[in-house]
């Protein structure tokens, strides 16, 4: 139609220069098209150089988009991240802060002589809590061993007791049970809260990770011509009115965002998972339950060894011999009273149960967030047509949109006909990602039936996907028992640069 | 055999700050507390502080608090000693001390390293 | 804080002569005690913890006893090279408060 040929390119220019581009680069009216690399070749109001200007921006406006999605995800993980933490530390704090309260009235030098140790099992805690790489069994193990050979030498100041008696107590102590069944209890007990706990928070950890990870994958360049041709062919091709066509806006994002798709199964395992473990929290060896009593258990510990003193006594030196006698020591520690305790089974506060509920309905929202993402950005930021009929733009011109809309991920691209997808080479990052979520999911199946597993990143790219300090300094590497050599390994995923170490403590 | 190998002597001015390292040896780092205590010409000895190198948590001695810094580097198994606004006070030998089994009792110590604060 | 005191502060005594040494706290430290002994130049040498255990390599002329807040070290026989100066220290709690000392020299 020769009238068509001089139509005016106001409308273009308008929107040009809106988008911050000079206006002299475009026609007062509309020219041939042969020089158009990415839109259809027809009359167009558009030059080579605002073709390329417009595809860099609609690069730039989906990456963008795509980040601004993440960033709501990964803000929603951060706080649920932030407040459980928050909660289970504050659990843990106000147990020491029962105990540095109280054990000094019910327990006198027994506890003050020995206020280290105590402060120790607490710090270790608290770094097991926070993702130190260190066998929890053992710290209390260590604990209670230290805590004997001193409460031992408390309460036998008649008695010579060098390191080698001492030593030989240590190797009596798992068959005497010095402490009753406090250790054994907290030891099984502590061993599932902490678990659970800690690789609950780490699940959140990990999970925004990956989706922080996964939102700086550039888009390619395949992607790149799809997507100018989806939002401003229309305008260089002189239908600047035409909405995208849906289902061929979701063919576009489908092919873009193929590889993102493929994390869909391992994220809902992972969410699923995350959710599961929650019914860990509950009960007298869940997490509030068991980390807000810790002290109860050491109470009783102490109690029992000075109920069982004489027999103890009696039994350590029919395994280690008579000790000598110090000529110049007082008699035997007279027995203090009982160290009266509130009772171990803290009543819930409900802020746990608000927490859980509140996490659930949240992960239960997002379990689709992948492969839900084309068409949340379709509707959300593409300024769809209305409906699928034969006014929208499908890419070539207005009319109807014929192909089928692809399936989700990158091996149901093969046939995608807005995006040329090469499905054999999945995007590397993403792989890894997914093999975090995979490792993630492990661990929390793991933590459900009470066990801890060693937690090593798999991804191969040397980064792993910590979330930044997790780790002051070197807290990943674990204490050492002076009674083993087992190395200790840093961890990938501990908490997400959380609570500040305990750090500093002042006399 | 353990063994604890401190940094050289250090002249400092009043008001700088010195940092003393203290390298272990012979033993699992980790597995003990590390002691700073000092002892200034002609005095006796004074405890500075303690660090525990599994978990970097420490305990300074009040009258230290505001001007002392414990670390440790696990990597290479040395503390560190860091006091800072000095004056001609705290020109005093400073040694680092490793406990016998998590007692207090220091039954290892460096050599001492010798601080001098004169302008 | 717990603070130790020592007496004497300077002890004269002979190669053979039975020596003791005094430390007090201010606050029972029950059996948690030590004693250095370090001579001039040098870094402090554990010689008792545990107000009564000897440590080990350390010659059996050292001993130690007490409890609470009085706590003696005895030389039974004073060697030439027992003339130093013999701290005491609390090792119950921090901060871990050391004596003032005592000076043993020649007579």
């Known amino acids: 139609d020769p009238a068509s040929k001089s139509r005016s390119c106001g409308e273009v220019r308008q929107i040009y220069g809106a988008k911050g581009f000079s206006l002299s680069d475009v026609p007062q009216a509309e020219i041939s098209g042969e020089h158009l690399r990415i839109c259809p070749q027809g009359y167009t109001c558009c030059t080579s150089e605002m073709e390329e200007n417009l595809a860099n921006r609609s690069h730039a406006e989906l990456e963008t988009a795509l980040r601004d999605s993440s960033r709501v995800l990964q803000a929603m993980l951060a706080t649920q991240l932030r407040s459980f933490d928050d909660h289970f530390q504050h659990l843990l704090n106000d147990s020491e802060r029962t105990l540095q309260a109280t054990f000094p009235g019910a327990f006198g030098e027994l506890y003050t002589q020995n206020a280290r140790a105590f402060r120790d099992l607490y710090s270790e805690l608290r770094l097991y809590y926070r993702g130190a790489n260190l066998h929890l069994e053992e710290t209390l193990a260590e604990f209670w061993a230290r805590l004997l050979e001193r409460l031992f030498k408390q309460l036998h100041p008649q008695l010579l007791l060098p390191d080698d008696y001492l030593d030989c107590l240590g190797k009596q102590a798992e068959a005497l049970r010095p402490f009753g069944e406090a250790p054994r209890e907290l030891r099984l007990r502590a061993t599932r809260a902490f678990v659970a706990a800690r690789s609950f928070v780490q699940g959140l950890g990990v999970a925004s990770d990956v989706v922080r990870k996964v939102a700086q994958v550039p888009l390619g360049p395949e992607c790149s011509r799809a997507v100018m041709k989806l939002v401003y062919c229309a305008h260089c091709l002189g239908v600047p009115g035409a909405r995208p066509c849906p289902d061929y806006c979701r063919n576009v994002l489908k092919g873009c965002l193929a590889n993102q798709a493929d994390l869909d199964a391992e994220w809902r395992n992972l969410l699923d998972s995350m959710v599961l473990i929650t019914d860990k929290f509950w009960g007298t060896s869940g997490v509030e339950s068991v980390i807000g009593s810790v002290h109860t258990w050491l109470a009783e510990a102490i109690n029992a060894l000075q109920d069982n003193r004489d027999t103890l006594t009696a039994k350590v030196i029919q395994g280690c011999g008579n000790p000598k006698v110090n000529p110049q020591g007082p008699g035997p520690e007279e027995k203090r009273r009982r160290g009266k305790l509130a009772p171990r089974e803290r009543p819930p506060s409900g802020t746990l149960e608000k927490l859980v509920s509140e996490a659930k309905a949240q992960l239960r929202d997002v379990q689709d967030f992948w492969i839900s993402l084309p068409g949340t950005l379709c509707s959300e930021k593409m300024a769809l047509s209305t409906a699928s009929d034969d006014r929208c733009w499908n890419g070539m011109a207005r009319g109807r949109y014929l192909p089928e809309v692809m399936g989700d991920g990158l091996a149901n691209q093969i046939n995608n006909p807005e995006v040329e997808v090469d499905i054999t080479k999945p995007d590397m990052t993403i792989r890894q990602q997914i093999m975090q979520l995979k490792i993630m999911t492990n661990r929390l199946r793991s933590a459900y039936n009470g066990n801890d597993v060693d937690f090593q990143d798999a991804s191969d790219d040397g980064s792993g996907s910590g979330s930044g300090d997790g780790c002051l300094d070197d807290l990943c590497s674990r204490k050492v028992s002076r009674k083993s050599s087992s190395s200790r390994t840093p961890l990938t995923h501990a908490l997400p640069g959380l609570s500040e170490q305990e750090g500093q403590k002042t006399s | 055999q353990v063994q604890l190998v401190q940094s050289g002597a250090e002249v400092k001015k009043p008001g700088a700050s010195v940092k003393v390292s203290c390298k272990a040896s012979?033993?699992?780092?980790?597995?003990?507390?590390m002691h700073w205590v000092r002892q200034a010409p002609g005095q006796g000895l004074e405890w500075m502080g303690e660090?525990?190198?599994?978990?970097?948590?420490?305990t300074y001695n009040q009258k230290f608090k505001a001007r002392v810094t414990m670390t440790r580097d696990t990597s290479t198994s040395t503390v560190y000693m860091e006091l800072s606004s000095l004056r001609s006070e705290d020109t005093a030998v400073y040694y680092c001390?490793?406990?016998?089994?998590?007692?207090?009792?220091?039954?290892?110590w460096g050599q001492g390293t010798l601080v001098t604060v004169s302008s | 804080d717990i603070v130790m005191t020592q007496s004497p502060s300077t002890l004269s005594a002979s190669v053979g002569d039975r020596v003791t040494i005094i430390c007090r706290a201010s606050q029972s430290i029950g059996p948690w005690l030590a004693w250095y002994q370090q001579k001039s130049g040098k870094a402090p040498k554990l010689l008792i913890y545990?107000?009564?255990n000897l440590q080990s390599g350390v010659p059996s002329r050292f001993s130690g006893s007490g409890y609470g807040t009085d706590f003696t070290l005895t030389i039974s026989s004073l060697q030439p090279e027992d003339f130093a100066t013999y701290y005491c220290?609390?090792?119950?709690?921090?901060?871990?408060?050391f004596g003032p000392g005592t000076k043993v020299d020649i007579k």
């Open positions: 660090i525990n190198p599994s978990t970097g948590d420490t």
């Open positions: 012979g033993y699992t780092f980790t597995g003990y507390y």
């Open positions: 001390a490793r406990e016998k089994r998590d007692d207090g009792v220091f039954a290892y």
């Open positions: 220290q609390q090792t119950s709690s921090a901060p871990f408060t």
């Open positions: 545990g107000a009564s």
